[in-house]
């Protein structure tokens, strides 16, 4: 397992006690070029200056060449996640050369060892690939170097000593532990391939982060913040808690990375997109919806080479497994007056109506506090394709709902008895797709009736396309 | 053809070790990994652990901890798995199974068993 | 560690017979099973990887299916060298673990 604690080890083992016993460690890798997407099918192994190999399994000097990079092991023995990367390359790339380096001999120790012998593995890579350069028609810039956690610093050093540029360098979680925060050469960074991709599914802001925090390419994208994946919860991956531990948590959210890039190649037809935004925070806002100025990308193996002048964060939404795409929606609505708020925030959920779908009710998260005269912005995500919203149904969740709430108003009740009935007013709600990148305004369905109150819906239709009021000019808006 | 060929019976003691030796033919010796599974008289498969033999990196079940130690000998392409404090539960067929290089991979092919039987 | 439970533990039946043995793991596997065929004496065989994929050598009557936690394994029409014991394994988590066996026996 390529997490500093799998899910053959505890917790408490964390980076210090191997859980394999070492009868002999020589510092030796291999590379085993894939040639079919049957797992058990040998392949063959190519090693530096023999070039037969190379022609009796038919490596195709022009096509594309994967190179897929393994991390940290305490078994010794490959994960289901490389053979099922291996085979969505082959799916997709069907001409391409998909190469495993095995480097298990070196990274089935302490992590700490592991971790110092990622230079030495990198540096096979690179001579590796200055060997291939030496053959008529291979050309670095047809070479994809895909690392996981540890194996994405691996590719980091294989780019940084080759001679020439690699074309590409994925980095799906890239290891955090004696990484976060080093000096840009003794980790993945964006001058380590022409162009650098990352995905962040273990990024902690407290205890251990298994996968590096701060951005290390040209595009960092961290679905879901980053952090807490879906399905990933221990109830999620456990099934039932007698059968596993929170280790089993770890290596969901750490491998989910591998799983989202998996998704991108054989499911082409639902890419998933992230959106530049400064932090997490702003993005679960709504305000990072935007496609104007390369502000957006596709994730994984259809990202769009981006050579931003500095690191580039991007987030996006996703479901708990594959298709992993989701339709994100940035919600302003206009609070232009309430009364008797009290000390609580309102509850609100969404539901949106289509075309092809209607959503489910749908949270509004309120990551600060509702503001009045001024227009407050949502983030909401659909798993499905609604199609061309009609119509929206807001409802304020009424105090019983929630005990949290109940117990609040009860107290509010006994401080001022008589505080008459809460009430916001909304006349409109401007919603974007992220997707489609288009803006839609819906009003109240009775101009009249523009207050809601809780445990009531307020009902709003489609009553123009863009946002324009009198007086607006619509920006040009660029599809993704 | 792949043939995998174990040692004979055992007969311990009590609190005494054993090892078996597996053979393996047929195949790259140092391209799968060995793996020893055990079944008690009428009852079912118990994984016991793995070696790689490419480089001797091992992987035990928690069940056994310190007791088992897989090692093998490249030259000759042998696997072997020692058991130490043994208990008369440890009677047993033990086999050698050989499995490709992922965790899903199968044991496709195993060697025909050593039984070990433990008795005062 | 994920737990294989098989049912039935033992199976009377008739050559001809279409018999089904199913194996159920404690949390989903993802149809990394394995089902293995062993006679008294002797040790195990593959006879299916991958939830339905056939070993090389095994009968076409033989095969696979399932998803998620539970599988089957299926004899379209038994034959009388198909009277033995039968295994599932998981291959997704360390430990490797195994069902408790399922007995075809001669009805």
């Known amino acids: 397992s390529p997490v500093p604690f799998g899910p053959e080890g505890r917790l408490e083992d964390k980076l210090h006690k191997p859980k394999a016993t070492q009868t002999e460690v020589k510092p030796s890798v291999r590379f085993n070029l894939r040639t079919s997407k049957d797992p058990e099918h040998e392949g063959c192994y190519l090693s530096v200056g023999h070039s037969q190999p190379l022609e009796d399994c038919s490596f195709n000097m022009t096509a594309k060449t994967f190179f897929i990079i393994h991390g940290w092991t305490m078994s010794g023995i490959f994960e289901n996640w490389l053979h099922k990367l291996v085979s969505a390359l082959h799916t997709r790339e069907k001409d391409a050369n998909v190469v495993v380096v095995d480097w298990l001999p070196l990274a089935h120790q302490l992590y700490t060892d592991a971790v110092n012998n990622t230079r030495v593995v990198g540096h096979s890579i690179a001579r590796m690939l200055d060997w291939l350069q030496e053959k008529d028609d291979f050309s670095l810039g047809n070479v994809h170097l895909i690392g996981y956690s540890l194996g994405a610093h691996v590719a980091g050093y294989a780019g940084n000593f080759v001679k020439g540029t690699v074309g590409r360098i994925t980095g799906l979680d890239p290891a955090g532990p004696m990484f976060e925060g080093a000096d840009i050469h003794k980790r993945l960074s964006p001058d380590d391939a022409d162009f650098v991709d990352v995905l962040h599914t273990y990024t902690r802001s407290f205890g251990l982060s298994i996968g590096i925090q701060m951005p290390v390419g040209h595009i960092d994208i961290y679905p879901n913040g980053g952090d807490f994946q879906p399905g990933c919860g221990l109830n999620d991956v456990l099934g039932s808690i007698a059968y596993g531990t929170i280790t089993e948590v770890v290596k969901c959210e750490h491998e989910r990375a591998v799983h989202l890039f998996v998704d991108s190649l054989v499911n082409q037809d639902k890419p998933s997109f992230a959106f530049q935004c400064t932090d997490s925070n702003r993005f679960k806002k709504g305000i990072c919806l935007s496609c104007r100025k390369n502000r957006c990308n596709s994730i994984g193996y259809n990202a769009k080479k981006m050579r931003n002048k500095r690191n580039s964060k991007m987030y996006l939404k996703t479901r708990a497994g594959m298709p992993f795409r989701v339709y994100h929606y940035q919600m302003k609505i206009h609070v232009f007056s309430y009364k008797n708020m009290g000390e609580i925030e309102p509850t609100f959920y969404v539901t949106l109506y289509g075309t092809n779908a209607d959503s489910q009710t749908l949270p509004l998260e309120i990551v600060e506090r509702i503001e009045q005269n001024a227009t407050n912005t949502f983030l909401v995500y659909t798993e499905e394709d609604l199609g061309d919203l009609l119509k929206i149904q807001l409802t304020w969740e009424g105090a019983s709902q929630s005990w949290y709430n109940l117990w609040k108003e009860f107290r509010s009740y006994l401080s001022q008895p008589r505080n008459p009935g809460r009430e916001l007013n909304i006349r409109r709600i401007r919603v974007k797709s992220g997707e489609t990148q288009r803006k839609l305004t819906f009003c109240t369905e009775d101009p009249e009736n523009t207050s809601i109150s809780p445990g009531r819906e307020l009902w709003f239709r489609k009553c123009r396309d863009g946002w324009r009021m009198k007086n607006e000019t619509s920006p040009t808006v660029e599809l993704p | 053809q792949v043939q995998l060929v174990q040692s004979g019976a055992e007969v311990k003691k009590p609190g005494a070790s054993v090892k078996v030796s597996c053979k393996a033919s047929?195949?790259?010796?140092?391209?799968?990994?060995i793996h020893w599974v055990r079944q008690a008289p009428g009852q079912g498969l118990e994984w016991m652990g793995h070696?790689?033999?490419?480089?001797?990196?091992?992987n035990n079940n928690e069940k056994f901890k310190d007791r088992v130690t897989m090692t093998r000998d490249t030259s000759i392409s042998t696997a072997y798995m020692e058991l130490s404090r043994l208990r008369s539960d440890d009677t047993a067929v033990y086999y050698c199974?050989?499995?490709?290089?992922?965790?899903?991979?199968?044991?496709?092919?195993w060697g025909q068993g050593t039984t070990v039987t433990v008795s005062s | 560690d994920i737990q294989m439970t098989q049912s039935p533990s033992s199976l009377s039946a008739s050559v001809g017979d279409r018999v089904t043995i199913t194996c159920r793991a404690s949390?989903?596997?993802?149809?990394?099973l394995n089902w293995y065929q062993q006679k008294p004496g002797k040790a195990p065989k593959l006879l299916i990887s991958?939830?339905?994929k056939l070993h090389s050598g095994v009968p076409s009557r033989f095969s696979g299916s399932g998803s998620g936690t539970d599988f089957t394994l299926t004899i379209s029409s038994l034959q009388r060298e198909d009277f033995a014991t039968y295994y599932c394994?998981?291959?997704?988590?360390?430990?490797?673990?195994f069902g408790q066996g399922t007995k075809l026996e001669i009805k």
């Open positions: 199974a050989r499995k490709g290089i992922y965790y899903s991979s199968p044991f496709d092919y």
């Open positions: 047929g195949y790259t010796f140092t391209d799968n990994t």
């Open positions: 070696i790689n033999p490419y480089y001797g990196g091992t």
């Open positions: 949390q989903d596997i993802n149809n990394y």
């Open positions: 991958y939830t339905s």
């Open positions: 394994q998981q291959g997704n988590t360390l430990p490797f673990t």
